[in-house]
Interface confidence: medium
């Protein structure tokens, strides 16, 4: 570590005296600059010497010497006071810039340590400090305003009592800059714009920032627009607003508009698209299939997406039949606006009843005309089964009728014993009817099919079961013969062994 002679840490001299400061180290040493022109600097082997033949109050400051080759980076310092009876202060800088909440050092150095007891900080021309100004003083460094606030950006003077009289330093201007958290906040209104050729349009680009030092511009595609700027200040933020007003739009006005704002922290931009059309439009679409199938008792939401300009003048859901003349309840119809020109309309159909199957149409109107989108709703039902014993062409026949949607398929089972339902262990024979006869198949209604099992003799201690199933469920009907003597003759193509 280098050593300074005289040993210090402080040296007090009078103006006009000669001052010599010698720094000695193991290797080469140097004085931390900048050294004022009043000093002469020369090297003498491993030492460096600063000397002045005519010390002035402006030589008052801390002189530090370092040894560049020292791996520990040690340094030595001495503080020189040149106590001028007329000059209590040496001001090292007339402007100090800090960010809010940083400590601000006002570098007025006292030229005579004896005066320390009578120092104070005032604003220019002896005005008192603002309330809540928290400061401290160091004779080596000056006044420190702790955690400086924006409002404390003022002109200050350092004051010292000399012979009962306050003597001021020259003024120091403190600038306290607001901490800019990021690029300016932006809004571009509207987020999307559609106009018919010849209509008027307005696009507003506004930016706000914590201080006034920021720029904002509006760009159309790649062209920067020259628009007058309106400025304002509210909510502790500076606002800059650019308004593009177009009296009669044409196709060349269409395209991408970007609002761009920048400050010291960077740039922020947001964009919108302006579409110019020849005439009004109204488009209806759905992400759903227009043909819907739902199990009876369940619910369904029918959704229609609408894209329109100008806005809708009317819309409604209509039930087109074929069953009752009921209409959807308004409370079940819901409209949501995704943005200015796109809307979603939903019809909620909870716990669907048989009479609610059929066609549902969404109709909408704007100056471009009427449009409609129709859904076809078919209800699914699990099969309902019934078996009767009848004679057809003199032959005894089991007749199974199954009704449901989708169309049920039919299986016959013969099993041992009397039972309500055949289980696997009891099954003696199974017949699958590949083509049951369709008795009725009307739109939006159940499909009814019929399957025949011709019986010559029915075994007395056996059960004959007709089973029907579809994607919704299954149903069955067991038939137990009352008298013996008949035998069954299923068609050949029906027969298989389980």
């Amino acid at each position: 570590i280098p050593v300074i002679e005289p040993s210090g840490p402080e040296l007090v001299v009078k103006p006009g005296e000669t001052v010599t400061l010698r720094c000695v180290g193991n290797g080469s040493v140097e004085w931390d600059g900048p050294i004022s022109p009043h000093w002469t600097l020369y090297s003498d082997g491993p030492s460096s010497v600063l000397t002045t033949n005519n010390a002035t109050f402006q030589n008052t400051r801390t002189y530090r010497c370092t040894e560049p080759g020292d791996p520990l980076g040690g340094s030595a310092a001495i503080h020189l006071y040149v106590k001028d009876p007329a000059r209590p202060w040496n001001v090292l800088a007339k402007e100090v810039v800090v960010f809010e909440d940083q400590d601000a050092l006002l570098p007025c150095l006292l030229t005579d340590p004896v005066l320390e007891a009578g120092v104070s900080l005032v604003r220019l021309r002896g005005r008192p400090l603002l309330r809540h100004t928290n400061y401290s003083f160091s004779p080596w460094h000056g006044f420190i305003i702790h955690r400086a606030k924006f409002i404390q950006g003022q002109d200050y003077q350092c004051s010292a009592l000399m012979g009962g009289r306050k003597v001021m330093s020259i003024s120091i201007r403190l600038k306290v800059q607001k901490v800019i958290p990021g690029p300016p906040a932006l809004t571009l209104v509207p987020a999307e714009l559609v106009r018919i050729r010849g209509e008027a349009a307005q696009i507003v680009c506004s930016a706000s920032n914590i201080d006034v030092d920021f720029d904002v511009f509006l760009q159309h595609n790649t062209t920067k627009l020259a628009i007058p700027q309106r400025s304002d200040f509210h909510d502790n933020r500076y606002q800059k607003v650019l308004t593009l007003s177009l009296g009669q739009v044409d196709f060349q006005h269409a395209g991408n508009y970007s609002c761009v704002a920048s400050n010291v922290q960077g740039k922020h931009s947001t964009s919108m698209f302006f579409r110019v059309v020849e005439s009004a439009y109204l488009d209806l679409s759905s992400e759903q299939n227009l043909i819907q199938e739902v199990t009876v008792g369940e619910g369904l939401n029918l959704k229609v997406m609408v894209e329109a300009y100008p806005g809708l003048q009317g819309f409604n859901w209509t039930y087109l039949g074929p069953f009752s003349d009921h209409q959807p309840e308004p409370k079940l119809a819901n409209a949501t606006t995704k943005d200015t020109y796109r809307h979603t309309f939903t019809l909620s159909l909870p716990r669907l009843k048989p009479s609610e199957a059929g066609r549902y149409s969404f109709l909408a109107r704007n100056p471009g005309g009427w449009r409609a989108l129709t859904f076809e709703l078919t209800l699914r039902y699990p099969p309902e089964v019934s078996v009767i014993w009848t004679s057809i062409n003199g032959s005894g026949t089991l007749l199974c009728a199954a009704s449901g949607y989708p169309q049920p398929n039919v299986t016959w089972l013969q099993c041992a014993g009397h039972t309500d339902r055949c289980d696997e262990a009891q099954v003696l024979q199974v017949w699958v009817d590949p083509h049951p006869e369709v008795l009725s198949q009307e739109p939006f209604q159940k499909v009814t099919v019929q399957s025949l099992l011709t019986a010559e003799t029915l075994e007395h201690n056996q059960t004959y079961e007709c089973r029907a199933h579809n994607s919704v469920g299954s149903g069955s009907w067991a038939f137990i013969p009352i008298s013996a003597g008949a035998r069954t003759h299923p068609p050949d193509e029906f027969l298989f062994t389980p």
Epitope: I151, G153, D155, I170, S171, V176, D211
Partner: antibody
Framework: QVQLVQSGAEVKKPGSSVKVSCKAS????????IIWVRQAPGQGLEWMGD????????NYAQKFQGRVTITADESTSTAYMELSSLRSEDTAVYYC???????????????WGQGTLVTVSS | EIVLTQSPATLSLSPGERATLSCRAS??????????LAWYQQKPGQAPRLLIY???NRATGIPARFSGSGSGTDFTLTISSLEPEDFAVYYC?????????FGGGTKVEIK
């Protein structure tokens, strides 16, 4: 080029108030103090007060303390001087001036407004 | 409070002549090697115009015939050769400490 444009001449009754505006263009408004100076007919220049537009803090000459209010709107780059309880001796040309960028020497006025004549008469 | 006294109150000269205007401060306006004094020119019906700051530095665009000198309490504005447009009132101003004060002015008129 920096320009300071002041509001037009005013005729006021004694006891009333006057508010003079000074709009700056062509420079960074917040960087320099705005200083108000007045000049009575045939008289010299008299400092009234000043404002730091950067944070809105104003200083007033002792003579005008309590009667003058200096404000600045950084968003429109405009400074205002309002003088209340007017009397006939307040008849003067009121100037706004901008402090120059001479950091070694604060309160040197390098740009001036054209002046606003305020006449106080009953 | 520092008072600035200008003399003479009126100076009658012809174009081409040298004008010497004085400004005296009631106490020193120099500090740390700087002189806190400025000079302004004012023509009838116009706003003042900055000529000199720091006692001797010419402001932007000011012709070389205008020069300032002095330190401490005594300051001088010199116009080496008067042009017709130089006939006006000249004010000195204390530009840093205490009050922002002006001298009473010196009128330079055509003889």
């Amino acid at each position: 080029q920096v320009q300071l444009v002041q509001s037009g001449a005013e005729v006021k009754k004694p006891g009333s108030s006057v508010k003079v505006s000074c709009k700056a263009s062509g420079g960074t408004f917040s960087s320099y103090y705005i200083i108000w100076v007045r000049q009575a007919p045939g008289q010299g220049l008299e400092w009234m007060g000043d404002i730091n537009p950067y944070n809105g803090t104003a200083n007033y000459a002792q003579k005008f303390q309590g009667r003058v209010t200096i404000t600045a709107d950084e968003s429109t780059s405009t400074a205002y001087m309002e003088l209340s309880s007017l009397r006939s001796e307040d008849t003067a040309v009121y100037y706004c001036a901008r402090e120059g960028p001479y950091f070694s020497n604060l309160y040197v006025m390098d740009y001036w407004g054209q002046g606003t004549l305020v006449t106080v008469s009953s | 409070e520092i008072v600035l006294t200008q003399s003479p109150a009126t100076l009658s000269l012809s174009p081409g002549e040298r004008a010497t205007l004085s400004c005296r401060a009631s106490q020193s306006v120099s500090y740390q090697g700087e002189n806190y004094l400025a000079w302004y020119q004012q023509k009838p019906g116009q706003a003042p115009r900055l000529l000199i700051y720091d006692a001797s530095n010419r402001a932007t665009g000011i012709p070389a015939r205008f020069s300032g000198s002095g330190s401490g309490t005594d300051f001088t504005l010199t116009i080496s050769s008067l042009e017709p447009e130089d006939f006006a009132v000249y004010y000195c101003q204390l530009s840093n400490q205490d009050l922002l004060t002006f001298g009473g002015g010196t009128k330079v008129e055509i003889k």
